[in-house]
């Protein structure tokens, strides 16, 4: 005897109580594949979570974090406070990046400025708390009399900005 349940499309479930009739998923539940014997309950985006995508009969809700926070982990399973660019989140809250480091995002850690001299280059644009240094051509690559936006300053690498 053919299993009638295999004919039930996504968004329905195979109702054993009704001779294997395909019944629509009840409110706040879904089935993302055909042939399901039950519908799964929808995820609730509450508390620190807000709804990014509403639950439908064929797909689960998707959560995001409330304003000022960002998702961590699979399926946005935790919310972490945003910081400003030029900061990182520590156990004591958002702290400015130390000299010689930068963070150009609202999340993550401060990273060291690029050391241009490791590639035989010079600093073209100085680093800040929010931005990495920009490396330019090496001093040897500059023809006599050539000028650059910022004179090479190997002694000040990796970059410098007034704090």
């Amino acid at each position: 005897l053919q299993d009638l349940c295999s004919n039930c499309p996504a968004g329905t479930f195979c109702d054993n109580n009704r001779s294997q009739i395909c019944s629509p998923c009840p409110p706040n539940s879904f089935s993302s594949a055909g042939g399901q014997r039950t519908c799964d309950i929808c995820r609730q985006c509450k508390g620190v979570f807000k709804t990014r995508k509403e639950c439908s009969s064929t797909s689960n809700a998707e959560c995001d974090c409330i304003s000022g926070y960002h998702c961590l982990g699979a399926e946005c399973s935790m919310c972490e406070q945003d910081c400003k660019q030029g900061q990182e989140l520590t156990k004591k809250g958002c702290k400015d990046c130390c000299f010689g480091t930068f963070n150009d995002q609202k999340r993550g850690i401060c990273r060291p400025w690029t050391n241009c001299s490791l590639d035989g280059k010079s600093v073209l644009v100085n680093g800040t708390k929010e931005r990495d240094v920009v490396c330019g051509p090496s001093p040897a690559d500059l023809s006599p009399g050539a000028s650059s936006a910022t004179p090479p300053a190997p002694a000040r690498e990796p970059g410098h900005s007034p704090q």
């Epitope: 309950i41 995820r43 399973s77 406070q81």
Partner: antibody, heavy 115, light 107 residues
Amino acid sequence: QVQLQQWGAGLLKPSETLSLTCAVYGGSFSGYYWSWIRQPPGKGLEWIGEINHSGSTDSNPSLKGRVTFSVDTSKNQFSLKLNSVTAADTAVYYCARLTGPFDYWGQGTLVTVSS
Amino acid sequence: EIVMTQSPATLSVSPGERATLSCRASQSISSILAWYQQKPGQAPRLLIYGASTRATGIPARFSGSGSGTEFTLTISSLQSEDFAVYYCQQYYNWPLTFGGGTKVEIK
């Protein structure tokens, strides 16, 4: 370092109101949700409910409306009141920060209900 | 509400051995599950969130796996400080619910 410090009366008589307060030190207060969880002696954990800085709340239906939450953003504090307590409410009560899971917890307050 | 069931209730393991703890949800919760460790007289401590992501400062010997209704916490090589009670918790749906706990004791 985020720290949660809680206090409140530890011994109550039946029908009285349980009152606990939790202060948050370090980190951000606004934006997060703040929860209460309890643990009867030798048993598991039960979520009581939560509140955010603007006073939005949610609570466990099992407590049948006996619970009230409040928040004082000027002091970075939030509070729990549970009225008409019985011996079944005897537990260690914890406050915690809700970031999805509970990532920071208070030290716990043992509340005993006895006549 | 979603009911969380943990097994076994007690697990006797020798130091250095592997411990495997199970948690089952009464309905699918995707990967929206956390694990906590609680020692006597202390508050629980978050170990794992999102079923498999270690919280800040948690040693690599703790790992979580699973999705849907079946979840596992594995402690690869038990240290003396790991003997404690472990709880799973779902935050997929409200009310938030915990499992009954698994006590990991010294064999």
